[in-house]
């Protein structure tokens, strides 16, 4: 029950996170005009990953897309790429996790398959969240660098006569949406990975007891070969009772009535 809840919650959290990453990627307010300590202008500038906008005091807003690909800064291209990779991985992760949900029955899918799918989607969510966080952080760093550069050149005098005010940009709403969404996707992915452990079919590591018959005398030798842990062809009906939590040194094998011929 706890596993189902963890998996379900992980899915929902990731879903919200990915929706947030998509929203952040589409938002125009990645950077907004800094109004603090700036001459007050009757226009407000803000920029996104795909277009820049200007809002006049009347409320009239005009947006222009970045119609060039080669003319854009490499950092902006990198941020776009990170966000898109995050969205794609997240979307695939969501698709995989739907089929992996314990509460959904699809044919005769074994728990081991569901566990693998849950782990896969969990890893995808983690990478997706990291991509979004990285993308937003790269953009934020770019803004901080440009902010201090434009502060240093706030007023660039033209022949000492005319002053040109440089527009400074600060963090826009999309950055915060992106950070939160990336974090949620990451948390959702971790929850899916935790749920995967509980979904895995339980198997026991039987402790093999070997014995050597030299001539007519029977010698018992404890702690021989360890049983296969589940990837071989001889593991079909094995059960794991100790979950592999203890080492061979910690668990001593004692002879039972089945150990002797």
């Amino acid at each position: 029950m706890a596993v189902t809840a963890c998996q379900g919650l992980g899915f929902v959290v990731s879903l919200i996170g990915i929706a947030g990453i998509i929203a952040a990627t589409c938002m125009d307010q990645w950077s907004t005009q800094d109004l603090y300590n700036n001459p007050v202008t009757a226009v407000f500038n803000y920029q996104g990953l795909w277009r820049s906008c200007v809002r006049e005091s009347s409320g009239f807003t005009e947006c222009r897309g970045y119609f060039t690909l080669l003319g854009l800064p490499a950092m902006l291209q990198a941020v776009r790429a990170l966000m898109i990779v995050g969205i794609v991985l997240g979307a695939i992760g969501l698709l995989v996790s739907i089929f992996a949900l314990k509460c959904i029955r699809i044919g005769s899918m074994e728990d081991s398959a569901k566990a693998n799918m849950t782990l896969t989607s969990g890893i995808m969510f983690i990478v997706s969240g990291l991509c979004a966080i990285a993308g937003v952080s790269v953009f934020a760093n770019m803004l901080v660098t440009n902010f201090w550069m434009s502060t240093a050149n706030m007023y660039t005098g033209m022949g000492g006569m005319v002053q040109t005010v440089q527009t400074r940009y600060t963090f826009g709403a999309a950055l915060f949406v992106g950070w939160v969404a990336g974090g949620l996707t990451l948390i959702g992915g971790v929850m899916m990975c935790i749920a995967c452990r509980g979904l895995a079919p339980e198997e026991t590591n039987y402790k093999a007891v070997s014995y050597h018959a030299s001539g007519h005398s029977v010698a018992y030798k404890p702690g021989g070969f360890k049983a296969s842990t589940g990837f071989g062809s001889n593991t079909k009906n094995k059960k794991i009772y100790d979950g592999g939590a203890r080492t061979e040194d910690e668990v001593q094998s004692y002879p039972s009535k089945h150990d002797y011929v």
Epitope: Q33, P39, V40, T41, A42, V43, N45, Q47, S52, C53, V54, E56, S57, S58, G59, F60, E62, R64, V162, Q163, T164, V165, T167
Partner: antibody
Amino acid sequence: QVQLQQSGAELARPGASVKMSCKASGYTFPTYSIHWLKQGPGQGLEWIGYINPNTIYTNYNQKFKYKTTLTADKSSSTAYIQLSSLTSDDSAVYYCAREGYGRGNAMDYWGQGTSVTVSS
Amino acid sequence: DIVMTQSPSSQTVTAGEKVTLSCRSSQSLLNGGNQKNYLTWYQQKPGQPPKLLIYWASTRESGVPDRFTGSGSGTYFTFTISSVQAEDLAVYYCQNAYFYPFTFGAGTKLELK
């Protein structure tokens, strides 16, 4: 058609206050900001400030901040300007003007003006 | 505050003549976000309120004759009347529509020769 009808001329004593009105018609009043401007006799134009009737947000020219109060009444589609502590320097024609939408913050329609004379 | 300087303060013209008025601002009125100049031109005839002619430095308001044109960028702007008509005799103001408080030039008065 868009019209801004301003109240009649005012004659006031120094130290008194006057309140002028600007009634808008022909458009949705709260959608557009109303600017107020002053033009002294034989002088140029001075921007006093503006009010957004929808949000009641005001933006004043610091020079007129303590002299004027801008208000608006959505129900009657009317904007008001109040001048306090009048002096002879306040004698001028006061205009209200509508800020155009998508007009680069320009004022596209103007009232006919209200003449204020401060005299003892 | 932004200082708007207009020249000449007055100009005597004859009908049909081409007239160019200039306006200079103390700071650039060019907005980098949309590459538009927030400069406006108004015409004011005696006893009348100002009338909007040009906004965004070069965009003509609807209903304004095409003999009126605006140009310039940054801090220097010009206003041209290609062929002056008798009804064009008025005072022309340029206005900073970018920085608060909005400021106007002292105006250029067009007079008939």
